[in-house]
Interface confidence: low
């Protein structure tokens, strides 16, 4: 199709080489067409025109994204050619940064239902640059945490070195929806709830004598509880002794509950005590069996192919540890009678 009639938008992504970060492009179809496709309508119901020139479907994923190769080749369907770019409804997610993401991206409706629709498309010229050392050293992270129940703030990484007074007007989106009230480089959250978690996008306009473009940054915000002040609990095994049958295989499970820590390095392992000897056992990998906001339950099993007389004289010890401390629980095997 002819892309000369597409509206054009220029975006700049300055990424940090120090951290992982993502980027998004919204299919910013001209108002009010966008509302038909992406439900990202910025107009209030009173402002919606009576006659829409572009009668699209309401299917949220009903847009097609293309990349325009720089050598003038035909447009390429994003989904077929770029595994690190994912389309989610009307948003294009770039999972990894890099200058190779620079280029022109075009979005348009999949279904062309009227002559007007042919020109209903947006061309986004994306320039991707690594952050220079001269840039602000302490810029806000692209991953930010908010402590549940407290006051918090979300900073726009590309503007976090500027004072509020110097900062240009910022447009914020949360999970693709415009946050029309927020205009500064920092969103202040009076009381943090779990629904404040999500993908935030901050845009501001930068101009020089020749042109203007939108500088965009993406912030992944997660809501967290405070770091635990306690060491892990062993939930299982509960009892100190376990009745077993000689010659039979046996699996003993160790389940431990670890409190939330931002830097989480849980340890869960089995070792065996036999008179004065003590050694760690090579056992299957630990697995997380339940994860909540406050804590995580991790399980690790010790497997004996066959219970022997010698095993009855040993103690099987589960050892769990976090940054606060460790807990152990030992199990003595006892032969089943009768």
């Amino acid at each position: 199709f002819n892309i000369s009639g597409c509206s054009t938008k220029k975006l700049l992504w300055t990424y940090s080489t120090r951290s992982e970060e993502e980027f998004v492009l919204f299919c910013d179809l001209p108002e009010p067409q966008k509302s038909h496709f992406c439900h990202r309508n910025r107009l209030s119901p009173k402002q919606v025109p009576e006659h829409l020139p572009f009668m699209g479907s309401n299917d949220l994923s009903d847009v097609q994204w293309y990349q325009q190769p720089s050598n003038g080749d035909p447009l390429e369907d994003i989904r077929k050619s770029y595994p690190h770019i994912i389309q989610d409804k009307c948003t294009l997610h770039f999972l990894t940064p890099g200058v190779n993401n620079s280029g022109s991206y075009i979005c348009r409706p999949k279904m062309i239902k009227s002559p007007y629709d042919v020109a209903c498309c947006v061309k986004m010229i994306l320039e991707v640059k690594p952050q220079t050392n001269a840039s602000c050293e302490y810029s806000a992270s692209h991953k930010q945490d908010l402590l549940l129940g407290s006051t918090g703030s979300i900073s726009c990484p590309s503007l976090s070195c500027q004072s509020d007074a110097q900062s240009p007007a910022v447009t914020w989106y949360k999970n693709g929806k415009l946050l029309s009230v927020e205009r500064s480089n920092r969103i202040v959250v009076d009381e943090v709830y779990d629904y404040h978690q999500g993908t935030y996008v901050c845009d501001y306009t930068q101009s020089d004598t020749v042109s203007s473009w939108t500088v965009r940054a993406v912030v992944q915000v997660r809501t967290i509880v405070g770091d635990t002040k306690l060491k892990p609990d062993i939930l299982d095994p509960v009892e100190d002794t376990l009745e077993v049958e000689l010659g039979k295989p046996l699996t003993i499970s160790c389940k431990a509950r670890f409190g939330f820590e931002r830097v989480f390095n849980p340890v869960i392992k089995w070792y065996i005590k036999d008179s004065d000897l003590e050694w760690e056992v090579s056992v299957p990998e630990a697995k997380s069996i339940k994860s909540t906001l406050k804590d995580e339950i991790i399980e690790r099993n010790i497997i004996l192919e066959k219970v022997t007389q010698r095993d009855l004289r040993r103690k099987f010890v589960c050892f769990v540890q976090n940054s606060i401390g460790n807990t152990t629980q030992s199990v003595q095997l006892k032969e089943k009678r009768g």
Epitope: L230, K231, D233, I234, L235, V238, F260, K294, D295, T327
Partner: antibody, heavy 121, light 111 residues
Framework: QEQLVESGGGLVKPGASLTLTCTAS?????????MCWVRQAPGKGLEWIAC????????TYYASWAKGRFTISKTSSTTVTLQMTSLTAADPATYFC?????????????WGPGTLVTVSS | DVVMTQTPASVSEPVGGTVTIKCQAS??????LAWYQQKPGQPPKLLIY???TLASGVPSRFSGSGYGTEFTLTISDLECADAATYYC?????????????FGGGTEVVVK
Amino acid sequence: QEQLVESGGGLVKPGASLTLTCTASGFSFNGNYYMCWVRQAPGKGLEWIACIYADNSGSTYYASWAKGRFTISKTSSTTVTLQMTSLTAADPATYFCVRHKPAGGSSYILWGPGTLVTVSS
Amino acid sequence: DVVMTQTPASVSEPVGGTVTIKCQASEDIESYLAWYQQKPGQPPKLLIYSASTLASGVPSRFSGSGYGTEFTLTISDLECADAATYYCQCTLYGVNFVPNVFGGGTEVVVK
């Protein structure tokens, strides 16, 4: 035989303080379990107050209503105390000392007979 | 924190009958639930732990079932000695909290 015995209960005036003691016999506080205090007002249900981890980490847990006014401490390998301050008409109850395991295996759940606290002017 | 809701508050059944007491947790507590029997002037006595495991010395007339949020204590072949108040308790200890909470209790009257 493993046993818990509470002591220190009695009659106190409103606003007074009191310390209850739980003494263990037949075992000592050094494992992967908790020592807790639970109370029961006359004719009412059971109400958990606080727990302390039985090893030397001193990890404590309180019911939200008990924070600030009640303090649980491990004073030796066989004694745990509950300090209560600013006692009110809402505090009279039988106070039980309980040994508990995180996952609640039977041999770890052990209750003392209780000690009665009365608050009256 | 977890809230345990016990029903009914009171139940009356003849000797030889069956009593069913329900306990509902406000969130998933897996099988971390205990049942107690308490008689006047005595501390609670453990009947069942891990939702369905009978504590030692407890007659098999007592049985527990359930998982997650819904739990049941059943007493069959009621005897006069079963007249008491029964409590459920969440025995799941979190790491920053101990939701060591009890249900409100069910008084069992044996006629």
